[in-house]
């Protein structure tokens, strides 16, 4: 193979710092939907970390869509006021973690997860399929990530920060590698696995942005989202290369990718999405 064909995405073997999404829909791409209306709406852009305007077609689309700039900011951005830490040295959980599990007024027997404030753990419950409340997660992992406490009584890192007990300052949550990464990958790498609506059971891989790894899942054969790869290699190539290691003094670093030499500017900035 020539040098041109080699792939040298810059990824360490150690586990990557997790991206904590208080609500994964804040990471969805703006989706105007299939209809033809022209409606001004707002979405959260994970790359600019800002709420931005887009034109919505009036039907379908996804949950990263808000009537007003204020509503978008409230759901998907963190401002300084939201980063106040409880005096107990425990970072504040979102309010909905303290809601009781609510099956809702319909009866559809859907398995979901909720945070039980008595046991301090995420537990399974049967959701009826409509209404209920926000203490309702499709996966145990998402529930734990958002509502459970991590070791030492700290909450699992919602902002990517925790309180430094010595000087009460906000510091990056410790991870297995230094916080020397920025995410440049496609936004769908941050969306949850979605098996879709059909009945097949195809082996696929999705990028789990919480643990920074590609993981297998069963795809139904239709629908779903773009975080869906036929091989682990393809998944890694598309998503894991998005985390680029920073050089100590910044500057430029050459990366070699198939058929294309590319210069990537390196700078460190965490991306964290917080929903109130």
């Amino acid at each position: 193979d020539s040098e041109e064909d080699e792939e040298h995405t810059i990824i360490t073997d150690t586990e990557l710092p997790p991206l904590k999404l208080m609500h994964s829909f804040c990471a969805f791409k703006a989706d105007d939907g299939p209809c033809k209306a022209i409606m001004k709406r707002f979405f959260f852009n994970i790359f600019t970390r800002q709420c931005e305007e887009f034109i919505y077609g009036g039907c379908e689309g996804n949950q990263n869509r808000f009537e007003s700039l204020e509503e978008c900011k409230k759901m998907c951005t963190r401002d300084n006021a939201n980063r106040i830490i409880k005096t107990t040295l425990q970072q504040e959980k979102p309010d909905f973690c303290f809601l009781e599990e609510d099956p809702g007024i319909c009866r559809g027997y859907i398995t979901r997860y909720f945070y039980n404030n008595q046991t301090k753990q995420c537990e399974r419950f049967k959701y009826g399929g409509c209404l209920g409340n926000m203490n309702n997660f499709e996966t145990l992992e998402e529930c734990k990530n958002i509502c459970e406490d991590g070791p030492n009584g700290f909450q699992v890192d919602n902002y990517g920060t925790q309180l430094n007990a010595v000087n009460n300052s906000l510091t990056p949550q410790s991870t297995k590698v230094p916080s020397l990464f920025e995410f440049h990958g496609p936004s769908w790498c941050l969306t949850p696995a979605d098996r879709g609506l059909c009945r097949a059971n195809e082996n696929r891989f999705y990028y789990n942005s919480v643990i920074g790894k590609c993981r297998p899942f069963k795809y139904s054969g239709c629908g779903g989202n773009e975080n869906n790869f036929t091989s682990k290699q393809e998944c890694l190539r598309a998503c894991k290369k998005g985390f680029i290691q920073r050089i100590s003094k910044g500057g430029l670093i050459k990366t070699k990718r198939k058929r294309k030499k590319q210069r990537v500017k390196i700078a460190y900035e965490e991306i964290f999405v917080k929903n109130m």
Partner: antibody, heavy 123, light 112 residues
Framework: QVQLQQSGPGLVKPSQTLSLTCAIS??????????WSWIRQSPGRGLEWLGI?????????RYAVSVKSRITINPDTSKNQFSLQLNSVTPEDTAVYYC?????????????WGQGTLVTVSS | DIVMTQSPLSLPVTPGEPASISCRSS???????????LNWYLQKPGQSPQLLIY???NRASGVPDRFSGSGSGTDFTLKISRVEAEDVGVYYC?????????FGQGTKVEIK
């Protein structure tokens, strides 16, 4: 066939408490395949949902924010009925009040309604 | 709150002719499992409302097949293929995608 029979006063003085009862026949207030709601209708506001109760592993209730601080909906399992209490009423609360059954199983809709009670708030 | 907007507010009809009522929601009422979280009710003069159509397009028991519901996303339609005199009254759409449950302002159907 489920039937809902409403009872309660038609005239309430301002600042007092509006109390209505809905007696259920043909179903149980504790049924896990239904939920029980109060809805009111006035010329100015149209149909306005006020709140709902339902029993699953335990009792749940949800209320409209517009009346949340003043409303209580309670089940009475011994009499197989549920009640509405709305505190500190004003003339704005004048409306026809309906109790309704929400079918949780198949239809996911209000499939049975009480006959309605016109409540006037006036001194 | 999800706002439900109906049109027209008044609909004069001729018996035997078709009629159509539109309901638009301020956000999508279609869940990813395909369920549409929208119902239609008819309130005949002097009566309580009655459920006509549930989950967007299913007729409630006892509802004649001249009534049909359709639509997805934010735009929904109730159609009466051939209006009969007994169909007069006020028609309401209602969403149960999120609390509070909300109704449209109603469409009054009357015979010309």
């Amino acid at each position: 066939q489920v039937q809902l029979q409403q009872s309660g006063p038609g005239l309430v003085k301002p600042s007092q408490t509006l109390s209505l009862t809905c007696a259920i026949s043909g179903d149980s207030v504790s049924s896990d395949s239904a939920a029980w709601s109060w809805i009111r209708q006035s010329p100015g506001r149209g149909l306005e949902w006020l709140g709902i109760i339902y029993k699953r592993s335990k009792w749940y209730n949800r209320y409209a924010v517009s009346v949340k601080s003043r409303i209580t909906i309670n089940p009475d399992t011994s009499k197989n009925q549920f009640s509405l209490q709305l505190n500190s009423v004003t003339p704005e609360d004048t409306a026809v009040y309906y109790c309704a059954r929400w079918d949780s199983d198949k239809m996911w809709g209000f499939d049975d309604w009480g006959q309605g009670t016109l409540v006037t708030v006036s001194s | 709150d999800i706002v439900m907007t109906q049109s027209p507010l008044s609909l004069p009809v001729t018996p035997g002719e078709p009629a159509s009522i539109s309901c638009r929601s301020s956000q999508s009422l279609v869940f990813r499992d395909g369920n549409t979280y929208l119902n239609w009710y008819l309130q005949k003069p002097g009566q309580s409302p009655q459920l006509l159509i549930y989950k967007g397009s299913n007729r409630a028991s006892g509802v004649p097949d001249r009534f049909s519901g359709s639509g997805s996303g934010t735009d929904f339609t109730l159609k009466i293929s051939r209006v009969e005199a007994e169909d007069v009254g006020v028609y309401y759409c209602q969403q149960y995608d999120s609390y509070p449950l909300t109704f449209g302002q109603g469409t009054k159907v009357e015979i010309k």
